[in-house]
Every structure is written in structure tokens, then in C-alpha cells.
Amino acid sequence: SGVFQLQLQEFINERGVLASGRPCEPGCRTFFRVCLKHFQAVVSPGPCTFGTVSTPVLGTNSFAVRDDSSGGGRNPLQLPFNFTWPGTFSLIIEAWHAPGDDLRPEALPPDALISKIAIQGSLAVGQNWLLDEQTSTLTRLRYSYRVICSDNYYGDNCSRLCKKRNDHFGHYVCQPDGNLSCLPGWTGEYCQQPICLSGCHEQNGYCSKPAECLCRPGWQGRLCNECIPHNGCRHGTCSTPWQCTCDEGWGGLFCDQDLNYCTHHSPCKNGATCSNSGQRSYTCTCRPGYTGVDCELELSECDSNPCRNGGSCKDQEDGYHCLCPPGYYGLHCEHSTLSCADSPCFNGGSCRERNQGANYACECPPNFTGSNCEKKVDRCTSNPCANGGQCLNRGPSRMCRCRPGFTGTYCELHVSDCARNPCAHGGTCHDLENGLMCTCPAGFSGRRCEVRTSIDACASSPCFNRATCYTDLSTDTFVCNCPYGFVGSRCEFPVGLPPSFPW
């Protein structure tokens, strides 16, 4: 679609006569008829296939024609066409004499023609005017012409329709050749596709307007490049949505089971060494001078009765000191200056000479010990309590204070964790060294088989169009992550294509 524009500039008819040579009365009141048609090797007046237009009376005999386009007038003359411009044309311009105001052919004199010109040739679409001048025996006409495209039509033939728009159907302006030029932030054939925030993940993110980054299910973060872990995941991460890959030292479905109690809680005090021994289970190895499950109790160094032969122990800041009884010496009063003649054995101990009487040895009755039978036997020195139990002296006997999960005189018996039937929903209980383990029936999971789980919801491949399926264990459902161009809970609907355009 376009317009053939004809600008009449000057008409000369000095003698004021018709084409016949007859003088006009009262003068040649001149108007023009223009006929635009398809190319003809010899132009004939037949149907004006591209259009026709007439002017009012523009002047008498000889006159210049005013450019009237700015005022909405009729010069340049407009011959619109609604087809592809063929690049060639024929043009007939007739000058007619109208004695009166009625310009209809039947109202004109029989020989009202003043002049007629016919031209034909090639003409490309463009803004530049072609100037021409045609002379006949009695007249001269100067004019210019061009072909331009109508609004919203572009290209060499005005055949490409392009209407700038900024709405749901596209965001573009039109280039001179009719191709679309997307507005900033838009892309695609019809500039319908927003350009998402720079860096927005190609698969996991999308946008409905430029510089936006909306995340698909299972993804989060400014650029939708962070997966959302399983709901309830405590100490875990994911590489795909709904995963819960436990951090080091954590276990269980939700990574909420502490496998590294030592690191996470540092239970051992006073510089003790901590060893993990199962879930929420640990053992503290105390430094000298400390005791207790967590080595929280400070031991007096004299508690171990290091002084022999009745020596008395004194605590000091950096250790202890033995005050030896007469006849003894040494760090622990272990050296005797006595002989059996000095009756050195206490508590009914019997004395035996050694080294020709230079030394002796005491043979102690039960419950006494020491080089002079001066000590009651400490039944805890041999560490009789197993499994980390604490040994306590109680008069002539001893007792073991057991750690949780153990019993028996020497804490040698493991309490059966399975005794209280901790596994729910018919789970099978297994005693372990440091606790128990439940083997769950189908449809249940968790440490105690307390979590109801469905068969993998993705097992039936419910997602269409190569979508990725994720099982949401917290809701026993699946989530389909659609590839670009598909929507719907199962990605079953293609996104509606834009309507076809006529170019």
C-alpha cells in the first residue's frame, strides 16, 4: 500500500487556446485530470487501473501551482494504491477548460481539452521527487512525482506491513525495510520474548518483562541458580530441587541427625580428646587430673594415694608432695631405711627380710596394700567398669556408675534399645553398639519409621514434553519443571504461538 504523489508546478498556455486551437472563452480556466495505470508500451486512455484524480480550476491560461500540502490542499495530488508497487507505471495528465463551475465531463464544451500528456517508465519507491516537463504545440507543463509507502508499509514495493507496537503481541518499531526492531529488553521474531535479568538461569529462570528473573518450581535466588532443598532439610544442601544432601557430620532424611557431636557441640571439657561413637554419642579421653563423662571433674593428684609407706600427700599447684614417715624416703616414700626389726608392716602385715637384712618386704592381709600395707585396697585402680562407666569406692566394695545404655556390675551389659519397641508402623528394630536401627516397611521412612512416604510419584513419568520431574516427599506429589515453550501442571500445553502476520 502506498501513494503516487504528483506535484503540479507550472502550466503555460500563452495563447489561451484549447488543443483544437479554438480560443477559450473567457479564458482557459484550467483544471487537471490525472490517470495512473499499469505500464503500457504505448499509453492509451483506457481504465486508470492504479487510480484517478481531478483538481479544481487551478488558474487561467498560464499559472504556477501553489504547494498546498501543508494546508491540507490538493497539491501534491495523491493517488493511493493498495497493492504491491510494481516499479513501473503509465501516467496521463490532461488539462481541461471549464467555462463554468461544473467540472463534470458532460458540462464541458465538446472540445474542452487543452492538452494531454502521457508518460510511462520505471519508478522506485523513495522520498526523492522526479522533475519532468512536457511540451506540446501550444502548452507546457512542469511537474514532479514520486511513490512513497503508506503509513505502516515498508520495503521496495510497499508490500511489507509493519505497525509499531508495545503490547502483549510485540514490542518493536519498524525499520525502513519493514523488518522489526525490538524495543530495549525484548527479543524473538516478533519481539514478544522479554530479555531476562542478566545471568538469569536459562532453564530454571524465566521472566514476563525485561530485567526480571522469576524462578521455576524448585529454584530460588536472584538468578534462580540455587535449588530449593527438600522441605525440612536442616543441615543439608541440594544440586537439583528437593534434594537433601547432608553436610559432613549429619545424617538422616532431613540431615537433622548429628553424626559429629564432638565438632558441633564440643562436649569434652578441660582439653580432653573427643571421639564420635555414633549418633549423638561420644567418648571423652580426659587429660591427667580430670575425670567425669565430659572430663568436667578435676581430680586431686593425691586422690590416687601416690605416697607409700604411710607417707602423707600434699597437693601442690604443679603436682603433689609426699611427706615420708621416719625410715622412708624417695618421691613416693618408696625407699625404706627400716628392717623387720623396726616392725614396718601395718595392718597385720608380716615382714620378710631381704638382702641379708638390708631391706624387707611386707606381705599384706586382704583389703590392704602398699609397701607397708598402709593402704586400703582401691578397687577402682584396675578400671573395672566397662563402656565408659565411672568407678566409685564404697567401703570394702566398689560400684560402677554406668553411662546411658549400659548396665551390669561392671557396665558390661548393653541395655536393649529395642526393648521399648521404638520402631513405628511395624518397623523391625536392630540393636547396635551405639543405639538402634529401624528397618521400615514399604511406604514409611525416618529414624523410627514415623514418616509416611508414597511410592516415588515420578515413577509413572507424569511430565510431558521432556520436562524434569521432582518428587516432593513432604506432600507425596510430583512437580514438573517445564522446558521453555510449555506450561501446565504436567507441561502438557504449548505456549500459544503469536498470530500469523501477513508479511
Epitope: 483544437s20 486551437g21 486512455p45 464541458l108 464544451p109 465538446p110 472540445d111 474542452a112 481539452l113 504545440t137
Partner: antibody, heavy 119, light 106 residues
Framework: EVQLVESGGGVVQPGGSLRLSCAAS????????MSWVRQAPGKGLEWVAD????????YYADSVKGRFTISRDNSKNTLYLQLNSLRAEDTAVYYC????????????WGQGTMVTVSS | SYELTQPPSVSVSPGQTASITCSAD??????VSWYQQKPGQSPVLVIY???TRPSGIPERFSGSNSGNTATLTISGTQAMDEADYYC?????????FGGGTKLTVL
């Protein structure tokens, strides 16, 4: 139906006079130029005169100028040609014709009326 | 005075194309009309403004005009086309007719 019907022809002596009439019907007579064209026996067509729609403008062939007069009565839809000082060479069939405006030519013709100038 | 020159006669076989010319100085600058006249009948306008056919005139009649010559062309000539043909234009004194051409369909 568009129609032109001439009348008034006949035989007349040289120097004599005749008045030809042309009755128009089927179109708006007052809007059109009208003409008289004649054809001598065995000869070609010759334009005689024409008159504008309102009767203001009248044109004549050189051969009849000063002797013939064209006129019209739009109220009666009738065209006239007064023939005076007739000569032998004026002998012809006289046709009344509607002149199409704007160089269309003579688009409607009457059947003609014969004028014979003879002594 | 302005004279339009036509050949007195043209012959053509049925179904063939007949061309009748009309010549005058700078005739292409003017409009030419053509008339058909059969014996004993009034003339009938067959072409006006060089090449335009009035309604009712068969398509086999066509016209052209350029330079000094106007041409009436009858393609696929039929026996009923046998007639006298006159070209007509205008000069300063009024309408001018050519001398006429007798078309004979053999």
C-alpha cells in the same frame, strides 16, 4: 430511451430558408452541448454548428457562417437550426447530435432529415 | 484548416484484423473519436478519447493515437463490421471529420 428526432427538412429553392428542429428525450437536454452535422449524398460527414448547454456559446463552420443560426429551447428539449440563403451545396442529410462534453465526440445521433436545395 | 486524412478503403478477410488510420499534424496531442456508419443509417460512436469504447461496443474495437496518426483496429473482423468509418477531432473552428474509409469484409 435516449432519442433525437429531427424534422423540418424538405426541398427548397436556392436562396430559400428552412428551420430544422430536433426533439430530445431520455436525457437532461439542458446539461449538454448540442451540434448539427450534415452529410451530402455519397459524401462524408461535415460538422455544421454547435451550441453550449445554456445557449451562450455558438460556433459555426466557415461554410455556413452568417447564413445558418443554431439555437435551443431547453424548456421544450428542442434544438433548432435556421437555414437561410440556401445553396445547392447545402443539399445533405442533416443530423442532430448530442456532443459529449470533454472531447467524447458525438455520442447520440438522430436519424437525420433531408434538405434538398434545387431550382 | 485542419484536415484528417483516411484511406478511402480497407479490405479484410473475416476473422482477420483490420486497421484504419487517420493522420494529421500533431494529432497525438488531441483526442480522436471514431464513428461507424452503415448504409442508410446514422453514424454510431465506436471509440472516443483515442481508445475508450462506449458501452455496447464489442471489445474487438480498439483505438490508439500517438504522433501524427490515430488508428482504429478491429480484431477478428466479422461481416457485420462492413461499413464506413470516420475519424473525428477538433480544430479552431470546430469539429473536423476525416474523409471516411470503406471497410470491406471479403
Amino acid at each position: 430511451e435516449v432519442q433525437l428526432v429531427e424534422s423540418g427538412g424538405g426541398v427548397v429553392q436556392p436562396g430559400g430558408s428552412l428551420r430544422l428542429s430536433c426533439a430530445a428525450s431520455g436525457f437532461t437536454f439542458g446539461n449538454h452541448w448540442m451540434s448539427w452535422v450534415r452529410q451530402a449524398p455519397g459524401k462524408g460527414l461535415e460538422w455544421v454548428a454547435d451550441i453550449s448547454s445554456d445557449g451562450r456559446y455558438k460556433y459555426y463552420a466557415d461554410s455556413v457562417k452568417g447564413r445558418f443560426t443554431i439555437s435551443r429551447d431547453n424548456s421544450k428539449n428542442t434544438l433548432y437550426l435556421q437555414l437561410n440563403s440556401l445553396r445547392a451545396e447545402d443539399t445533405a442529410v442533416y443530423y442532430c447530435a448530442k456532443a459529449g462534453g470533454g472531447n467524447v465526440g458525438f455520442d447520440i445521433w438522430g436519424q437525420g432529415t433531408m434538405v434538398t436545395v434545387s431550382s | 484548416s485542419y484536415e484528417l486524412t483516411q484511406p478511402p478503403s480497407v479490405s479484410v478477410s473475416p476473422g482477420q484484423t483490420a486497421s484504419i488510420t487517420c493522420s494529421a499534424d500533431n494529432l497525438g496531442e488531441k483526442y480522436v473519436s471514431w464513428y461507424q456508419q452503415k448504409p442508410g443509417q446514422s453514424p454510431v460512436l465506436v471509440i472516443y478519447q483515442d481508445a475508450t469504447r462506449p458501452s455496447g461496443i464489442p471489445e474487438r474495437f480498439s483505438g490508439s493515437n500517438s504522433g501524427n496518426t490515430a488508428t482504429l483496429t478491429i480484431s477478428g473482423t466479422q461481416a457485420m463490421d462492413e461499413a464506413d468509418y470516420y475519424c473525428q477531432s477538433w480544430d479552431s473552428s470546430g469539429a473536423v471529420f476525416g474523409g471516411g474509409t470503406k471497410l470491406t469484409v471479403l
